[in-house]
Amino acid sequence: EEELQVIQPDKSVLVAAGETATLRCTATSLIPVGPIQWFRGAGPGRELIYNQKEGHFPRVTTVSDLTKRNNMDFSIRIGNITPADAGTYYCVKFRKGSPDDVEFKSGAGTELSVRAKPSAPVVSGPAARATPQHTVSFTCESHGFSPRDITLKWFKNGNELSDFQTNVDPVGESVSYSIHSTAKVVLTREDVHSQVICEVAHVTLQGDPLRGTANLSETIRVPPTLEVTQQPVRAENQVNVTCQVRKFYPQRLQLTWLENGNVSRTETASTVTENKDGTYNWMSWLLVNVSAHRDDVKLTCQVEHDGQPAVSKSHDLKVS
């Protein structure tokens, strides 16, 4: 007569994180008396998942009623699966014994693989702003996915980037994985409205990739161009001199007028106008009382933009 066999019909089971895994097991006999136990892993370090005889296993339910006479179905369901549950599960028949039950026969094992979605990609740029023509690095990170296979792409304004490096960790077997990618982007003066996008595609996303974005407005600094011009005389002894501050970003800007090197007035850009490319223009003027000067006057428009060293433009005012 054949002795009891423990049958685990499924070599592997694939379950999405958060769902319930069903691990199937049947015995061919009710002999010997003793419980079925489920373990994850083999050997002395194996983890007890369920014991028919005793214990409390809140995540585990049996598929059939084990108190029913003649029941030989020892399949279990494990709820709320996470990547940490991945592994090989063994259905093991024990024989009633004193002082402890004795392992009698084990099933061949069922490998539980957990499909876990990657977290939303987080894109981060450089800590400090950079100016056009400079190359800056952006990083993209996503975590907690399984299996390991994943695709990451970079885009700038819809155009795919090619200068990037990607790593998936760890290299060996793990319950879940992380991806880290660094892309290099060359800034242009038109990038205030630009976006850098990191796109992650994974089997769990069913063809709908996750995206993380970074706005280059947080990375770029476009320094202003200055132009100082003298307007026609407004009154008998007053001259209006304007300083045109053009194409700058961000808005944070302070302007100082100097008359022959002496500070005349300082102001902060407030009512700026915005260009189509996202940069700003601003104009400041200075009324100079010509009669107060016997000699020619050197007028300087000095601009400090976004905490950077000041740039200036001068204009010589002739006193006739």
Partner: antibody
Framework: RQLVESGGGLVQPGGSLRLSCTAS????????ISWVRQAPGKGLEYIGT?????ITYFASWAKGRFTGSKTSSTAYMELSSLRSEDTAVYFC????????????WGQGTLVTVSS | DIVMTQSPSSLSASVGDRVTITCQAS????????LAWYQQKPGQAPKLLIY???TLATGVPSRFSGSGSGTDFTLTISSLQPEDFATYYC???????????FGQGTKVEIK
């Protein structure tokens, strides 16, 4: 679905007897068959369980004198070195206890040990 | 070996009465629930009523119930019927597979 015992009768002290337990309507292959006896006017006494091969066990008082075997349809129990105190009705039942309790039972067969 | 002590050894009751029989094990039964109750009528084989301490066997009326864990167990008949007059046995299993012992029985008689 029933069990029928046979093989009981009168046997002299020191003698042997082979009891049979035959299943009809179901197979014994995935179940143990347990034997229980009841001396006249007394309570029930567990003897042992016949499983497969190595999975056959008897109460400590029955070891050595009682042995058993089983096919898919019939279980056997061999009684040897019989004594007068072994006089009893011998029942067989399907099951090995715990989550496989004794059910159904045979009608019993009387073994009388007397000279 | 495990020893099962049943009480009372006999009782007299009327139809409709609630009857309680107890069974005490000398040590915790296997899995704290290896306890079955059987009913036997004169000249008949025993019949399974309850197993795993509290699981009602198929076809057994719901007036029979079992409770308990470890060493102390109870069989309750909520409303005694004429066909319930019989002898009741508990069967407890110890940790060894051959360690199965019946209680001495409780005879339920008509008052």
């Amino acid at each position: 679905r029933q069990l029928v015992e046979s093989g009981g009768g009168l046997v002299q002290p020191g003698g042997s007897l082979r009891l049979s337990c035959t299943a009809s309507g179901f197979s014994l292959s995935s179940h143990g068959i347990s034997w229980v006896r009841q001396a006249p006017g007394k309570g029930l006494e567990y003897i042992g369980t016949i499983g497969t091969g190595v999975i056959t066990y008897f109460a400590s008082w029955a070891k050595g004198r009682f042995t058993g075997s089983k096919t898919s349809s019939t279980a056997y129990m061999e009684l040897s070195s019989l004594r007068s105190e072994d006089t009893a009705v011998y029942f067989c039942a399907r099951g090995s206890a715990w989550n496989d309790p004794f059910d159904p039972w045979g009608q019993g067969t009387l073994v009388t040990v007397s000279s | 070996d495990i020893v099962m002590t049943q009480s009372p050894s006999s009782l007299s009751a009327s139809v409709g009465d609630r009857v309680t029989i107890t069974c005490q094990a000398s040590q915790s039964v296997y899995g704290n629930n290896d306890l079955a109750w059987y009913q036997q009528k004169p000249g008949q084989a025993p019949k399974l009523l309850i197993y795993l301490a509290s699981t009602l066997a198929t076809g057994v009326p719901s007036r029979f119930s079992g409770s308990g864990s470890g060493t102390d167990f109870t069989l309750t008949i909520s409303s005694l019927q004429p066909e319930d007059f019989a002898t009741y046995y508990c069967l407890g299993g110890g940790d060894d597979e051959a360690d199965n012992t019946f209680g001495q029985g409780t005879k339920v008689e008509i008052k």
